[in-house]
């Protein structure tokens, strides 16, 4: 169902797996990292060379596009049904142009439905990319250029590029614009984690990771 | 409500700096950031450059790089513009304004009142 | 740097006239531009950014468009009081720029 039942079965090496949708035998092809902190992550998210356009529709971020293993979006019905039936925790890597990395962890996340507009719940931040919160909280709605839920007339998806919960348009876009190395600074609509490397500051990569709260 | 209040008049001699602060209240500092701009008698509005007032980070304007310093004290939640080696055309209104810096949102509302700066010998 | 070409540099009109003052970005701008409006002794007041979104509290008689490189700012039914100077601004990218200005004379 998850990576964290993959792991659980045996299958302890990094790569792509098959995973199943809660209460159905629709499949969806997940990266699955089998060796950070004690394996079993479910990759949601990734960003690492700009291979992929990540400006895309709301039905393209409701099923999932790119590639598992270089850059993708898993799906948000996926994760809004993995994440509605256990309770999760989300890890968010992030790396910068000059070799430093850094984390954070949300002790507690799950999407709602769709006809919620895959709204963001998170609780309990810790890790080194930030004291705050770049995840507006409470969570807000997500956003893409064909659905416009971010609590601003701006249309913060367009400006900004990419779907994310915007919040008019808040501190992060971790599906924003990405610029290679110095072309990195002063990109108002690049990968964005504010309260770790502040504004303008596009990133070098992402990864968004969940395994439940259990494991 | 937010509001930034500026230092008062100055009147320097060419060669000599000033230093304008800018203090803020009504809101969150460290989410946002301050743009310093001018405009010399009857022209237009010149930006000088912008400051976080998160972390401090700062980008000027290619024609004061080296001349012009932005910091803020988080502490008293103001901003401070220091312009160097002062010129009688450096005579000038400098304003400092607010921008949400935290949503890569670079409009500037509101604005401070003005800092009159006279650069005569 | 991105340069923003104003025109007219100044109008005068009449009580309820349409006034349109039009903005040229010199690479595109998506909508990141914002219009502000200065009277003589104040500071400049935001009236629009996002290229069209209104601030909050300036009337409905201004409104604002465009993308890309072209932008305008009109004032449907002038009043008294919107006499002025006008200034767009890029927020693309630093350094950021102003248009150089649109004096609103009230005739």
């Known amino acids: 169902r998850d990576c964290a039942e993959v792991f659980k079965s045996g299958h302890t090496t990094n790569g792509i797996y098959t995973l199943t949708f809660p209460n159905s035998t629709e499949e969806i092809k997940a990266y699955c990292d089998m060796e950070a902190g004690g394996g079993g992550w479910t990759i949601i998210q990734r960003r690492e060379d700009g291979s992929v356009d990540f400006q895309r529709t709301w039905k393209e971020y409701k099923v999932g596009f790119g590639n598992p293993s270089g850059e993708y979006w898993l799906g948000n019905e996926f994760v809004s049904q993995l994440t509605n039936q256990q309770r999760y925790v989300l890890k968010i890597h992030l790396k910068d142009w000059e070799g430093n990395e850094a984390y954070s962890l949300y002790e507690h996340f799950y999407l709602s439905s769709e006809e919620l507009n895959y709204r963001i719940h998170l609780k309990g931040l810790t890790g080194t990319a930030g004291k705050i919160s770049s995840i507006s909280q409470p969570g807000n709605d997500f956003s893409t250029k064909d659905g416009d839920n971010d609590n601003c007339i701006c249309k913060c998806s367009q400006m900004l590029t990419g779907g994310w919960w915007f919040d008019a348009c808040g501190p992060s876009n971790l599906n924003g614009m990405y610029y290679p190395q110095r072309q990195n600074t002063n990109k108002f609509n690049g990968i964005k984690w504010y309260y770790w490397k502040g504004s303008g500051y596009s990133l070098k990569a992402t990864t968004m990771m969940i395994r439940p709260a259990d494991f | 409500q937010v509001q930034l209040v500026q230092s008062g008049v100055e009147v320097k001699k060419p060669g000599a700096s000033v230093k304008v602060s800018c203090k803020t209240s009504?809101?969150?500092?460290?989410?946002?950031?301050f743009s310093w701009v001018r405009q010399a008698p009857g022209q237009g509005l010149e930006w000088l450059g912008w400051i976080s007032g998160y972390n401090g980070n700062t980008n000027y304007a290619q024609k004061f790089q080296g001349r012009v310093t932005m910091t803020t004290d988080t502490s008293t939640s103001t901003a401070y513009m220091e312009l160097r080696t002062l010129r009688s055309d450096d005579t000038a209104v400098y304003y400092c304004?607010?921008?949400?810096?935290?949503?890569?949102?670079?409009?500037?509302?509101?604005w401070g009142q003005g800092t009159l700066v006279t650069v005569a010998s | 740097d991105i340069q923003m070409t104003q025109s007219p540099s100044s109008v005068s009109a009449s009580v309820g006239d349409r006034v349109i003052i039009t903005c040229r970005a010199s690479?595109?701008?998506?909508?990141?531009l914002a219009w502000y409006q200065q009277k003589p002794g104040t500071a400049p007041k935001l009236l629009i950014h996002s290229a069209s979104s209104l601030q909050t509290g300036v009337p409905s008689r201004f409104s604002g468009s465009g993308s890309g490189t072209e932008f305008a700012l009109t004032i449907n039914s002038l009043q008294p009081e919107d006499f002025g100077t006008y200034y767009c601004?890029?927020?693309?990218?630093?350094?950021?720029?102003f248009g150089g200005g649109t004096r609103v004379e009230i005739k």
């Open positions: 690479q595109g701008l998506s909508s990141w």
């Open positions: 304004a607010r921008d949400q810096d935290y949503s890569n949102f670079h409009w500037l509302d509101p």
């Open positions: 009504g809101y969150t500092f460290s989410n946002n950031g």
């Open positions: 601004q890029q927020a693309n990218s630093f350094p950021l720029t």
